[in-house]
């Protein structure tokens, strides 16, 4: 495929990659696949500068990110190694609480009115935020 | 070459709504990542942020003044306008738009009016 | 709401180094950036996003954040670096200004 050298429109550049936020709500798989028909991923945070860029604009709202433990252990959507990565949990998250009575446990992670990070019931709708790299090639196949 | 200009009355009687247009060039209200802002500077005192309009409509204000105020924008006129409503003799200032995009921070600023409250 | 606290005031003799500190609760978590302003002139953005320089800054200027201060320095300062300085935060994606601190060339 292509290179991407520029963002698509209504994206936002930043350190050499593109993010898109959105303003309604969706549950996190429905939001991950939203992500995914864009040629992105839920945004993927591996550095403090890019936790304090994804704030800024998200506000105090909860996001959904590319975070989740739904098949065992935490895994970022894009490969990341969660173990060795970036963090911003609240204090005693993530605690995969089973009291909220909808079932289950917590096992997708987003971003609270403060920033830090929260694990949640994964059909909550909250606002999600798409990340792509750019100079990476799209998945689209070559014109010939 | 990005420019901006604020225009309106230079004297509000006090319980006035104040009205204020940001025209600019150089620049798209449409383009991700770009805002125009709203500060303010009383006479011999500090910058205050007043509002705050994104690319995306998103809309924020400083909490201490959110009930007094409303950010619009006409993307078609290249134009942003701040409504403040029960002007106070304390509201006295110079009043600036700016523009921002991403977290750069307010990097082009217009040249300021300044709006006098007095009855 | 949040606050940033800077010095009324700093003095500093021609070709030395003036420091002018921003501090705020967990200031370091945020974006911190910084204006000069001179009489009768708008603000100019002199850093953004803690330490970076606008094109036509000159590299005298720079600028850290951590912990709950951001400092903004300038060496081998000028006559012509007299002016008012503000640092300024993104809280909760809502901007706040520091009160200003004005720096005097001896």
């Known amino acids: 495929g292509s290179e991407r050298t520029c963002c698509p429109v209504n994206w936002v550049e930043h350190e050499r990659s593109c993010y898109w936020f959105s303003r309604s709500g969706k549950a996190w798989a429905d939001a991950d696949n939203y992500c995914r028909l864009e040629d992105a991923h839920l945004v993927v945070v591996t550095s403090w500068e890019e936790q304090k860029f994804v704030q800024h604009h998200i506000g105090p709202v909860n996001t959904w990110m590319g975070l989740h433990d739904q098949n065992g252990p935490w895994k970022w959507v894009d490969g990341t190694d969660y173990e060795t990565g970036f963090k911003n949990w609240r204090p005693e998250q993530p605690d995969d609480w089973y009291g909220h009575g909808l079932g289950g446990g917590e096992d997708c992670a987003h971003f609270t009115d403060d920033g830090r990070w929260n694990d949640d019931v994964c059909q909550r709708p909250y606002r999600w935020v798409c990340e792509t790299e750019l100079d990476k090639a799209s998945q689209e196949p070559p014109l010939l | 070459q990005i420019t901006l200009k604020e225009s309106g009355p230079t004297l509000v009687k006090p319980t006035q709504t104040l009205t204020l247009t940001c025209t600019f060039s150089?620049?798209?209200?449409?383009?991700?990542?770009?805002?125009v802002g709203w500060i303010r500077q009383p006479p011999g005192k500090a910058l205050e942020w007043l509002a705050l309009?994104?690319?995306?409509?998103?809309?924020r204000y400083s909490p201490s003044l959110k009930s007094r105020l409303t950010i619009t924008r006409d993307t078609s006129k290249n134009q942003v306008v701040l409504t403040m409503t029960n002007m106070d003799p304390v509201d006295t200032a110079t009043y600036y738009c700016?523009?921002?995009?991403?977290?750069?921070?307010?990097?082009?600023w217009g040249q300021g009016t300044l709006v006098t409250v007095s009855s | 709401s949040y606050e940033l606290t800077q010095p009324p005031s700093v003095s500093v003799s021609p070709g030395q180094t003036a420091s002018i500190t921003c501090s705020g609760d967990?200031?370091?978590?945020?974006?911190a950036c910084w204006y000069q302003q001179k009489p009768g002139q708008s603000p100019v953005l002199v850093i953004y996003?803690?330490?970076k320089r606008p094109s036509g800054i000159p590299e005298r200027y720079s600028g850290s954040n951590t912990g709950n201060t951001a400092t903004l320095t300038i060496s081998g300062t000028q006559a012509m670096d007299e002016a008012d300085y503000y640092c300024?935060?993104?809280?909760?994606?809502?901007?706040?200004f520091g009160g200003g601190t004005k720096l005097t060339v001896l």
């Open positions: 967990k200031l370091g978590e945020k974006y």
């Open positions: 700016a523009h921002t995009i991403a977290v750069r921070g307010f990097d082009y």
């Open positions: 996003q803690d330490r």
């Open positions: 300024q935060a993104w809280d909760s994606s809502t901007a706040v």
């Open positions: 309009i994104y690319w995306n409509d998103d809309k």
């Open positions: 150089g620049f798209s209200l449409s383009t991700g990542g770009v805002g």
